[in-house]
């Protein structure tokens, strides 16, 4: 039902849910951190603006005494216990920030009238794709897929001049909530990548990732999976690998690549590593860079979040626009904001936008280098360096089917 | 009140390992990063590392890599440092402290600190 | 590894004096990363200020901090005897966090 909003006469609320079940398992206490620092961000411009407004945060903790997993598999009930929650109290704000689970997002949007916006650091699953009124701000499953396709089909490259149409995907059902989503897109036989794809099938057990490293009647030499190296190392161990395998890593939220005096160990040399860039900086295919302490994307959402909700509120209150309307509420999409770390680019959808590094170890030097890089704004890709000192044959990606092309 | 009551004082041989506890009360140890920050004498705090409770994730001082380990034990709200192959270098005082800022970039509830004495 | 250079390495003040200590930054960091503690003798060191100019709570107002870029500065605005102590400056925008050297105020 609708629910008056604490969202007008100079005082505007961000409403902001604590859910026990995170796509992240981020401390909540520094999570109301970085949304506090968003605040006061987000009060230092408006107040540079001229517009003498009051903007703070309700935070909304469930109980965690029925959905209390932690991850995000008994969450779809708990968003909405948190929106009744707010309905009772009737203190809802012009903005709602959360959830971050899809289960919990999708299910919010299906049981509500929303009139207002909603902004979630996560909801990877393409079921939370095309919301008139739902903004993401961490690289959902559909960015993935669009790379992937793009990529799979790159055949003008010094480094790749075979087109491919097969892969296997590894999804063994104990993935993280982002990687979750990424490979039930993946999976999906209704998605853009398996329309796009001629073979593609799903490994389940570890012994059938195992397997295939060495089957001379596998029917790709692409493999996709999602984690970090420790991950791919628990699966994969010293086995041998034949000479013409990828196994494509998609990584995105660890910038631990970039750290200096990292060494890719030895099991790493037949990955290719989907990662987001670390900054807004062009990437050379070395780098350097001051890391921020720990995987701060999911902080760094919810603070981002704050900051959009802040740029909004002042392109309307400039305008001598209402707030607490439906165009309030879907015009958090085909924009780009200031964020904490530089300019963030939604698209027509609400969706961030990113760049994403592909990259390789170097077999000269046993680092990570970047191989290209890709523009999920404008889908394409950007090869960075055109002459990599790859482990694969003659430094050329191989084929994705076993033999034909370099073996 | 909040506090981080620490382990008592350890005289350990050189080559030795010790495991400094440290007690969170008054919050939910799950609430906040923690970290570990080493102070020699005379000189300024270096850090060490911190985890993330709820996972125990954990991100690092190259520097101690390999020499600190850090875990949570969530159920006694107890988080705890491992520091191996001791030499004299390592005699110091070493703090565990809450994290706080996006992802724990200062501290602001200090424990009450371990002094580590590595003598033959 | 963001190095931090503070200055004066030791100073010595009256009640009432005001006082400024400095911390430089080898490379730019942002504002929202930048904090000061006290450690006074036999005690664990004690927030001060975080993100250069947020008085952490229970500390008096004569403590201010400001900067930006590479250069940040700590604030006493009267000197009194309790605040003898060392005082540190820490970043926390790169790994590792770091700390300055310190600087020691006594009562002079």
């Known amino acids: 039902s609708q629910v008056s909003q604490n969202c007008h006469n100079g005082s505007y609320e961000i409403s902001v849910l604590m859910m026990g079940n995170s796509a992240f398992a981020e401390p909540l206490k520094n999570l109301e951190d970085a949304v506090n620092e968003g605040l006061e961000i987000v009060r230092g411009r408006l107040q540079n603006a001229g517009l003498n407004v009051t903007v703070n945060a309700t935070f909304m903790y469930s109980d965690g005494l029925i959905h209390n997993s932690g991850d995000c598999r008994s969450s779809t009930c708990e968003g909405l216990d948190l929106l009744r929650k707010i309905s009772n109290a009737q203190r809802m704000g012009c903005v709602l920030i959360g959830p971050s689970c899809t289960y919990s997002t999708f299910q919010m949007y299906l049981d509500t009238e929303l009139s207002y916006p909603m902004i979630s650091a996560g909801s990877f699953g393409l079921s939370c794709d095309y919301k008139e009124t739902l903004t993401r701000l961490m690289s959902p499953a559909r960015k993935l897929m669009y790379f992937l396709v793009n990529f799979w089909k790159t055949n003008d490259l010094p480094f790749k001049t075979y087109s491919w149409s097969t892969s296997y995907v590894y999804k063994n059902g104990t993935e993280t909530e982002d990687c979750f989503w990424y490979l039930n897109a993946l999976e999906a036989s209704v998605s853009y990548f398996s329309h796009e794809l001629g073979f593609k099938v799903v490994l389940r057990q570890d012994k059938e990732f195992q397997d295939i490293l060495m089957d001379h009647n596998r029917k790709s030499n692409v493999i996709i999976m999602c984690g970090g190296p420790e991950f791919l190392y628990k699966l994969k161990g010293d086995r041998a690998v034949a000479e013409d395998i990828v196994i494509i890593l998609v990584d995105l939220f660890n910038d631990q690549y970039f750290e200096d005096n990292v060494t890719a160990p030895d099991y790493m040399k037949n990955v290719l590593v989907l990662t987001l860039s670390p900054g807004n900086s062009l990437l050379n295919s070395s780098f350097s860079r001051n890391l921020s302490p720990t995987k701060r994307d999911f902080a760094l959402a919810y603070l981002n979040g704050i900051l959009l909700f802040g740029h909004m509120l002042k392109i309307f209150l400039e305008n001598g626009e209402n707030i607490t309307t439906p165009k309030f509420a879907h015009a958090f999409r085909n924009l780009t904001f200031e964020g904490y770390d530089g300019p963030v680019t939604l698209d027509d959808w609400g969706d961030v936008d990113s760049t994403m590094v592909l990259l390789y170890t170097s077999v000269d030097t046993k680092k990570y280098k970047v191989l290209l890089t890709y523009d999920t704004h404008v889908n394409k890709t950007y090869p960075v360096d055109m002459s990599p000192t790859f482990t694969w044959k003659n430094s050329k990606l191989p084929n994705d089917i076993t033999g034909r092309g370099p073996q | 009140e909040v506090q981080l009551q620490q382990s008592g004082p350890e005289l350990v041989r050189p080559g030795a390992s010790v495991k400094i506890s440290c007690t969170a009360s008054?919050?939910?140890?799950?609430?906040?990063?923690m970290s570990w920050v080493k102070q020699s004498h005379g000189k300024s705090p270096e850090w060490i590392g911190d985890?993330?409770?709820?996972?125990?994730?954990?991100s690092d001082n190259q520097k101690f890599k390999g020499k600190a380990t850090l875990t949570v034990d969530k159920s006694s709200s107890t988080a705890y440092m491992e520091y191996r192959s001791l030499t004299s270098e390592d005699s110091a005082v070493y703090y565990c402290?809450?994290?706080?800022?996006?992802?724990?970039?200062?501290?602001?509830?200090w424990g009450t600190g371990t002094t580590v004495t590595v003598s033959s | 590894e963001i190095l931090l250079t503070q200055s004066p390495t030791t100073m010595a003040a009256s009640p009432g004096e005001k006082i400024t200590i400095t911390c430089s930054a080898s490379s730019s960091i942002s504002s929202n990363f930048l904090h000061w503690y006290q450690e006074k003798p036999g005690f664990s060191p004690k927030l001060l200020i975080y993100?250069?100019?947020n008085l952490a709570s229970g500390v008096p107002a004569r403590f201010s901090g400001s900067g930006s870029g590479t250069s940040y500065s700590l604030t006493i605005g009267s000197m009194e005897a309790e605040d003898v102590a060392t005082y540190y400056c820490?970043?926390?925008?790169?790994?590792?966090?770091?700390f300055g050297a310190g600087t020691k105020l006594e009562l002079k």
């Open positions: 402290a809450r994290g706080r800022g996006m992802v724990a970039r200062y501290f602001d509830i």
């Open positions: 820490q970043q926390g925008s790169g790994l590792p966090l770091t």
């Open positions: 008054g919050y939910t140890i799950t609430d906040y990063y």
């Open positions: 993100r250069t100019s």
């Open positions: 985890i993330n409770p709820n996972n125990g994730g954990t």
